[in-house]
Interface confidence: low
């Protein structure tokens, strides 16, 4: 499943490009193991935001079917419970270029120790 | 064609540099607040067309207070399951907005 | 008012190559997304793919090494392309567009291929 | 691929009886992303229920559907002379899309 998310992402890369979207979002770049949990849900949700921004069918269909796929894989895990991580809200907010490409490599860790 | 005034956003300011049709403008938190993960401080000028009268959308952003600050006073660690992310649309449109299949 | 029409041809010989053309219109191929869909006589419904509005296509795997969607977005048309026909893909192909949670809320009226020598 | 079982492949009922329609699915199909369909001979389907419950634009209000995971209901109240057709459940949890065999509901 992770690696169908990691395509949805290439996705609306490609989709994004022919747009405008300025939004800064909350993203985590040096993610510790023992906050990945927390750190992936924090890209999921900032996700929504590039889907309501865009207004594109598109990229919303795309969004929809990564957090699906995501919360797909992370319920198979089991319930791993993380403590003393950062909400989102305390993160950097970076530019959509950078927020992908750091959900890229945080979707690669997951893959790596599955 | 231009919008008027947009809405007010609990514990957020908007500096609108535009009021024509199809601009598109930010509405910022106030200091001590953040923007909640997940909802967008955008505002666009769109026209109702029943109407032919300007508007602006609203904006999906709650600005919470800055978790930082709240940190600072003693406090358990903030704890997370792996309960997964609900999608927030609940209709057919991008928008969340259930208005029959059309975009505005 | 949202349409959708197919068009092609009505017999295709068996190994040769099927060109559908979906004409639509009351909505844009840039922002929706069109989905072929198809279904032998008698039977049920089967997905072969989806053309996205900015272009990408998602495939059914059963179908891929063979399928291709491709748009013109000016003339508001979406093409399928299908190599090496056989009798087993007489159906009636249907496009349909594309609203959230992959669903199809406006379909176009059909047009049955035959495939026969 | 999610494999999506309809029952009973034929319902004969009479107008104003209430119609059941089972939809199964092999795998869990995540928040309930499954889709009803009525199709009449000689036209294109046309969808009635999306998201599992929620009733599609200009569909009468004696269509409604329910369920979740991997079991999935339509139910028709009462049935006009119009309802009887032959219905389609479709998933979109994955990849690829998948339809249902079909229930046909006919005049008893």
């Known amino acids: 499943n992770w690696v169908n998310v990691i395509s949805d992402l290439k996705k609306i890369e490609d989709l994004i490009q022919s747009m405008h979207i300025d939004a800064t979002l909350y993203t985590e770049s040096d993610v510790h193991p023992s906050c990945k949990v927390t750190a992936m849900k924090c890209f999921l949700l900032e996700l929504q935001v590039i889907s309501l921004e865009s207004g594109d069918a598109s990229i919303h269909d795309t969004v929809e079917n990564l957090i699906i796929l995501a919360n797909n894989s992370l319920s198979s895990n089991g319930n791993v419970t993380e403590s003393g991580c950062k909400e989102c809200e305390e993160l950097e907010e970076k530019n959509i270029k950078e927020f992908l490409q750091s959900f890229v490599h945080i979707v690669q860790m997951f893959i790596n120790t599955s | 064609i231009t919008c008027p005034p947009p809405m007010s956003v609990e514990h957020a300011d908007i500096w609108v540099k535009s009021y024509s049709l199809y601009s598109r403008e930010r509405y910022i938190c106030n200091s001590g607040f953040k923007r909640k993960a997940g909802t967008s401080s955008l505002t666009e000028c769109v026209l109702n067309k029943a109407t032919n009268v300007a508007h602006w959308t609203t904006p999906s952003l709650k600005c919470i207070r800055d978790p930082a600050l709240v940190h600072q006073r003693p406090a358990p660690p903030s704890t997370v399951t792996t309960a997964g992310v609900t999608p927030q649309p609940e209709s057919l449109s991008p928008s969340g907005k259930e208005h029959h299949h059309h975009h505005h | 008012q949202v349409t959708l029409k197919e068009s092609g041809p009505v017999l295709v010989k068996p190994t040769e190559t099927l060109t559908l053309t979906c004409t639509v219109s009351?909505?844009?191929?840039?922002?929706?997304?069109v989905h072929w869909i198809r279904q032998p006589p008698g039977k049920a419904l089967e997905w072969l793919g989806v053309?996205?509005?900015?272009?990408?296509?998602d495939y059914n795997p059963s179908f891929m090494s063979r399928l291709t969607i491709s748009k013109d977005t000016s003339k508001s048309q979406v093409v399928l392309t299908m190599t090496n026909m056989d009798p087993v893909d007489t159906a009636t192909y249907y496009c349909?567009?594309?609203?959230?949670?992959?669903?199809?809320?406006?379909w176009g009226q059909g047009t049955t291929v035959t495939v026969s020598s | 691929e999610i494999v999506l079982t309809q029952s009973p492949g034929t319902l004969s009922l009479s107008p104003g009886e209430r119609a059941t329609l089972s939809c199964r699915a092999s795998?869990?199909?995540?928040?309930?992303?499954l889709a009803w369909y009525q199709q009449k001979p000689g036209q294109a389907p046309r969808l009635l229920i999306y998201?599992?419950?929620k009733l599609a634009s200009g569909i009468p209000d004696r269509f409604s559907g329910s369920g979740s995971g991997t079991d999935f209901t339509l139910t028709i109240s009462r049935l006009e002379p119009e309802d009887f057709a032959v219905y389609y459940c479709?998933?979109?949890?994955?990849?690829?899309?998948?339809f249902g065999q079909g229930t046909k509901v006919e005049i008893k």
């Open positions: 349909a567009k594309n609203a959230a949670y992959y669903v199809m809320d406006y």
């Open positions: 479709q998933q979109r949890a994955s990849y690829p899309l998948t």
């Open positions: 998201a599992a419950s």
């Open positions: 009351g909505f844009s191929l840039t922002t929706y997304a």
């Open positions: 053309i996205w509005g900015a272009g990408s296509t």
């Open positions: 795998q869990s199909v995540i928040y309930s992303y």
